[in-house]
């Protein structure tokens, strides 16, 4: 009696269980009563990442430098190429099909989390006692200078964008 289901790594065809092709190979011909499944390795820039019965291998992803992409991991016959973004850029999606420039944190804001190839810069406002006077994708908020530890006094209070201005004791009003 012909089978209705096959074992793992097999497929049903013409009432017969045939072996699937292993990752990295494509199907050339189905098995018969007398022959095994015929498989062939994928070509140079192709891959198949599962046990399969595909007659064509998939083309490796192209990391287009015009879109800010570069190869993070070269593809094999069993894996696709993994793209990432050039330094200073990050992917616009999980599939990383294109890149955008990392955001900079404006003055008054510091970097909470530096951007990666897949995530943008996360900024946070500088609280009282801290400042950032630059637009940067790397700089955290800096603490105000402690005038006291320098034997000086505050002549002008700091803001979220400026440090305090220290001066000599005798200039105290």
């Amino acid at each position: 009696e012909p089978p209705t289901a096959c074992r793992e790594k097999q497929y049903l065809i013409n009432s017969q269980c045939c072996s699937l092709c292993q990752p990295g190979q494509k199907l050339v011909s189905d098995c018969t009563e007398f022959t095994e499944t015929e498989c062939l390795p994928c070509g140079e820039s192709e891959f198949l990442d599962t046990w399969n019965r595909e007659t064509h291998c998939h083309q490796h992803k192209y990391c287009d430098p015009n879109l800010g992409l570069r190869v993070q991991q070269k593809g094999t016959s069993e894996t696709d190429t993994i793209c990432t973004c050039e330094e200073g850029w990050h992917c616009t999606s999980e599939a990383c099909e294109s890149c955008v420039l990392h955001r900079s944190c404006s003055p008054g804001f510091g970097v909470k989390q530096i951007a990666t190839g897949v995530s943008d810069t996360i900024c946070e406002p500088c609280p009282v006692g801290f400042f950032s006077n630059v637009s940067s994708a790397f700089e955290k908020c800096h603490p105000w200078t402690s005038c006291e530890t320098k034997d000086l006094v505050v002549q002008q209070a700091g803001t979220n964008k400026t440090d305090v201005v220290c001066g000599p004791q005798d200039r105290l009003r």
């Epitope: 989390q113 946070e124 009282v128 006692g129 006094v153 505050v154 002549q155 002008q156 209070a157 105290l172």
Partner: antibody
Framework: QVQLVQSGAEVKKPGSSVKVSCKAS????????IEWIRQAPGQGLEWMGS????????NYNQKFQGRVTITADTSTSTAYMELSSLRSEDTAVYYC???????????????WGQGTLVTVSS | DIQMTQSPSSVSASVGDRVTITCRSS????????????LAWYQQKPGKAPKLLIY???TRESGVPDRFSGSGSGTDFTLTISSLQPEDFATYYC?????????FGQGTKVEIK
């Protein structure tokens, strides 16, 4: 010990100004921020502004649109809050409080004055 | 400006009860550099100036009984009175000191049931 003593109650006409004083003792006046907070009858607390007496640096709540001026006299360890163009809704208790002491980590208000009631009425 | 929202606006409780007051800010009060939350809690009794209870969201001011505790991080904070005492009937305010202008919650009145 830290003490903040405020001037007495005032009754003012709409359109006039009021100047409330806050005399500090028991700490270094020039290096600690003085904060001004008000509370209308039966209402919550509203921050008005602050001053670092030694430098004269100030911060203001923009809500008061230039009606408030905060000053300090380090020779007498006294801070002042002047509110101009008074209207009936400025009727409130006005408090001074001590803010950061120069350490940049004590921005909360750990000592308060007793409050000054300002009544604006025609 | 950072908005502070307290709830409930009033609560009726008995001596010995556990009372919880919540405060929510419109932006995070947690600063990543020092991992501190820029939030304070105050107690105010009628006709008196407010009194500092808690700062940095969870640090008790010296002299404040340990039945008062503060917790929370980011935008959600709680003041808990573990066992209400007669002298605790008052209005409680949260306040942020992250950036100017400082703002307060609208207050929570703890009344006798």
């Amino acid at each position: 010990q830290v003490q903040l003593v405020q001037s007495g109650a005032e009754v003012k006409k709409p359109g006039s100004s009021v100047k409330v004083s806050c005399k500090a003792s028991g700490y270094t006046f020039s290096t600690s921020w003085i904060e001004w907070i008000r509370q209308a009858p039966g209402q919550g607390l509203e921050w008005m502004g602050s001053i670092l007496p030694g430098s004269g640096s100030t911060n203001y709540n923009q809500k008061f649109q230039g009606r408030v001026t905060i000053t300090a006299d380090t020779s007498t360890s006294t801070a002042y809050m002047e509110l101009s163009s008074l209207r009936s809704e400025d009727t409130a208790v006005y408090y001074c409080a001590r803010g950061d002491d120069g350490s940049y980590v004590r921005w909360y208000f750990d000592h308060w004055g007793q409050g000054t009631l300002v009544t604006v009425s025609s | 400006d950072i908005q502070m929202t307290q709830s409930p606006s009033s609560v009726s409780a008995s001596v010995g009860d556990r009372v919880t007051i919540t405060c929510r800010s419109s932006q995070s009060l947690l600063f990543s550099v020092n991992q501190k939350n820029y939030l304070a809690w105050y107690q105010q009794k009628p006709g008196k100036a407010p009194k500092l209870l808690i700062y940095w969201a969870s640090t008790r001011e010296s002299g404040v009984p340990d039945r008062f505790s503060g917790s929370g991080s980011g935008t959600d904070f709680t003041l808990t009175i573990s066992s209400l005492q007669p002298e605790d009937f008052a209005t409680y305010y949260c306040q942020h000191y992250y950036s100017y202008p400082w703002t307060f919650g609208q207050g929570t009145k703890v009344e006798i049931k």
